[in-house]
Interface confidence: low
């Protein structure tokens, strides 16, 4: 009679994380008598996965009834597979011995590979806001996937980006892997509504890549443009001066009116109007009582936007043509602006 052979027909088995792996093994003979054991790995450090004779192996079930006398199928199922279960599994036949059973023959081994999905990509942008024309970096991270092969792409508003660097760690063999990528994005004034997308594609996703997004509204600062204009006289001694604050983002803005360098009024942008590109406009106005001034007045609209150094725009108000009214000490009415302007 031919000597017993241990046959593991599958060189490799691929299983998705969370599923059950079936590791097949058959013997060609019932002789010699003795149990089968399954190991992960070979050599002295091998890990016992299943012992037909004794032990408790809660994740392992046998495919056939090993208690039957004529059984030659020693296949096992391992439930709830994780990436940590990856490795080469050996089906080993032992010969009954005293006091211990003796290893008789091993199968060729079955390599178990585990497919695990990548985690949802997390995209993070710079800690501080940046202004248009500056280049900012975004990072994208995804973890826990296997096998190592993975594709990462960057998009800005649907257009693929090319300026990025990607690393998959670790470099060597591992039960699961992580990907880290950094992309450089040049900001434009129109980017308030823009999105940066990191797209991760992996065999476990089957055409449905995972996406992580970052809104450039959290990254960009669009500084305002200022325009100070003198409106027609409302009353005989009053001039209406407006400060148009245009195309700024984010909304956080404080405006101060100065008359000849002295603070006249400070207000915070409240009732703003939004432009199509996501930036804001705001208008503040000042009623100047020209009869209170003997000389020309320098009116300055000073704007502090999003905690940045103030920018200002001035307007010289000619008062020489207006009659002087003695005894008036109120140069400006403290009138706020709630008017809306749409551009």
């Amino acid at each position: 009679e031919e000597e017993l052979q241990v046959i593991q027909p599958d060189k490799s088995v691929l299983v998705a994380a969370g599923e059950t792996a079936t590791l097949r093994c058959t013997a060609t003979s019932l002789i010699p008598v003795g149990p089968i054991q399954w190991f992960r790995g070979a050599g002295p450090g091998r890990e016992l996965i299943y012992n037909q004779k004794e032990g408790h192996f809660p994740r392992v079930t046998t495919v056939s009834d090993l208690t039957k006398r004529n059984n030659m199928d020693f296949s096992i199922r391992i439930g709830n597979i994780t990436p940590a279960d990856a490795g080469t599994y050996y089906c080993v036949k032992f010969r009954k011995g005293s006091p211990d059973d003796v290893e008789f023959k091993s199968g060729a081994g079955t390599e178990l590979s585990v497919r695990a999905k990548p985690s949802a990509p997390v995209v993070s942008g710079p800690a501080a806001r940046a202004t248009p024309q500056h280049t900012v970096s975004f990072t994208c991270e995804s973890h826990g996937f296997s096998p190592r092969d993975i594709t990462l792409k960057w998009f800005k508003n649907g257009n693929e980006l090319s300026d990025f660097q990607t690393n998959v760690d670790p470099v060597g063999e591992s039960v699961s892997y992580s990907i880290h990528s950094t992309a450089k994005v040049v900001l434009t004034r129109e980017d308030v509504h823009s999105q940066v997308i990191c797209e991760v594609a992996h065999v476990t996703l089957q055409g449905d890549p995972l996406r992580g997004t970052a809104n450039l509204s959290e990254t960009i600062r669009v500084p305002p443009t200022l325009e100070v204009t003198q409106q027609p006289v409302r009353a005989e001694n009053q001039v209406n001066v407006t400060c148009q604050v245009r195309k700024f983002y984010p909304q956080r803005l404080q405006l101060t009116w100065l008359e000849n360098g002295n603070v006249s009024r400070t207000e915070t942008a409240s009732t703003v109007t939004e432009n199509k590109d996501g930036t804001y406009n705001w208008m503040s106005w000042l009623l100047v009582n020209v009869s209170a001034h003997r000389d020309d007045v320098k009116l300055t609209c000073q704007v502090e936007h999003d905690g940045q150094p103030a920018v200002s725009k001035s307007h010289d108000l000619k008062v020489s043509a207006h009659p002087k009214e003695q005894g008036s000490n109120t140069a400006a009415e403290n009138t706020g602006s709630n008017e809306r302007n749409i551009y």
């Epitope: 089957q206 055409g207 449905d208």
Partner: antibody
Framework: QIQLVQSGPELRKPGETVKISCKAS????????MNWVKQAPGKVLKWMGF????????TYADDFKGRFAFSLETSASTAYLQINNLKNEDTATYFC????????????????WGQGTSLTVSS | DIVMTQSQKFMSTSIGDRVSVTCKAS??????LAWYQQKPGQSPKALIF???YRYIGVPDRFTGSGSGTDFTLTITNVQSEDLAEYFC?????????FGAGTKLELK
């Protein structure tokens, strides 16, 4: 060997429902997405969408949103296409075809096809 | 959607000839292009993926070339079993789209 075997021809009336099956064998069913393609007489092949056999999540092409539904019976390695409220223009041959994972070298190319299921919708 | 144009609906050939079937994409699809052969009453058969890679079992008289928007399937030494309809398909962008097909027939 790898095979995709589809259910037989169907004759239906407008307004009825049909469910076409596609049984896969010879490979690990959950490692490949299952796509559906429509071939109407004299018309260009039209990709209807796919179902992720790993998660069961369907993706439909715009023209096939609403009356069309992809489903799975993973234990039987079978994918299904159901068409509700049938219309005359649904008359066509429907193919199931598999694609590899997105990252793979051959991406969204269809390497194996079912034999096709002919659907005739007529009153 | 990306439109795949196969300008020749029919092509005439003789056994042993060399024939080139062309396909044009309405926008850049890189090399994400496949070719299929379909005979009457049968399902399409995969020939080429990634513009130029033959599937296992496909005779080497079938050659794919091109990238971007212009692609060609060349059949050298045409055999009688090659008389069929040939489709191109892009898989660069969803929805996946096919060309209208080119029918190869005998002169």
């Amino acid at each position: 060997q790898i095979q995709l075997v589809q259910s037989g021809p169907e004759l239906r009336k407008p307004g009825e429902t049909v469910k076409i099956s596609c049984k896969a064998s010879g490979y690990s069913f959950t490692n490949y997405a299952m796509n559906w393609v429509k071939q109407a007489p004299g018309k260009v092949l039209k990709w209807m969408g796919f179902i992720n056999t790993y998660t069961g999540e369907p993706t439909y092409a715009d023209d096939f949103k609403g009356r069309f539904a992809f489903s799975l019976e993973t234990s039987a390695s079978t994918a299904y296409l159901q068409i509700n409220n049938l219309k005359n223009e649904d008359t066509a041959t429907y193919f199931c075809t598999r694609t590899r994972g997105y990252y793979d070298f051959d991406g969204g190319a269809f390497d194996y096809w079912g034999q096709g299921t002919s659907l005739t919708v007529s009153s | 959607d990306i439109v795949m144009t196969q300008s020749q609906k029919f092509m005439s050939t003789s056994i042993g000839d060399r024939v080139s079937v062309t396909c044009k994409a309405s926008q850049n699809v890189g090399t994400h292009l496949a070719w299929y052969q379909q005979k009457p009453g049968q399902s399409p058969k995969a020939l080429i993926f990634s513009a130029s890679y033959r599937y296992i079992g496909v005779p080497d008289r079938f050659t794919g070339s091109g990238s971007g928007t212009d692609f060609t399937l060349t059949i050298t030494n045409v055999q009688s079993e090659d008389l069929a309809e040939y489709f191109c398909q892009q898989y660069n962008t969803y929805p996946l789209t096919f060309g209208a097909g080119t029918k190869l027939e005998l002169k």
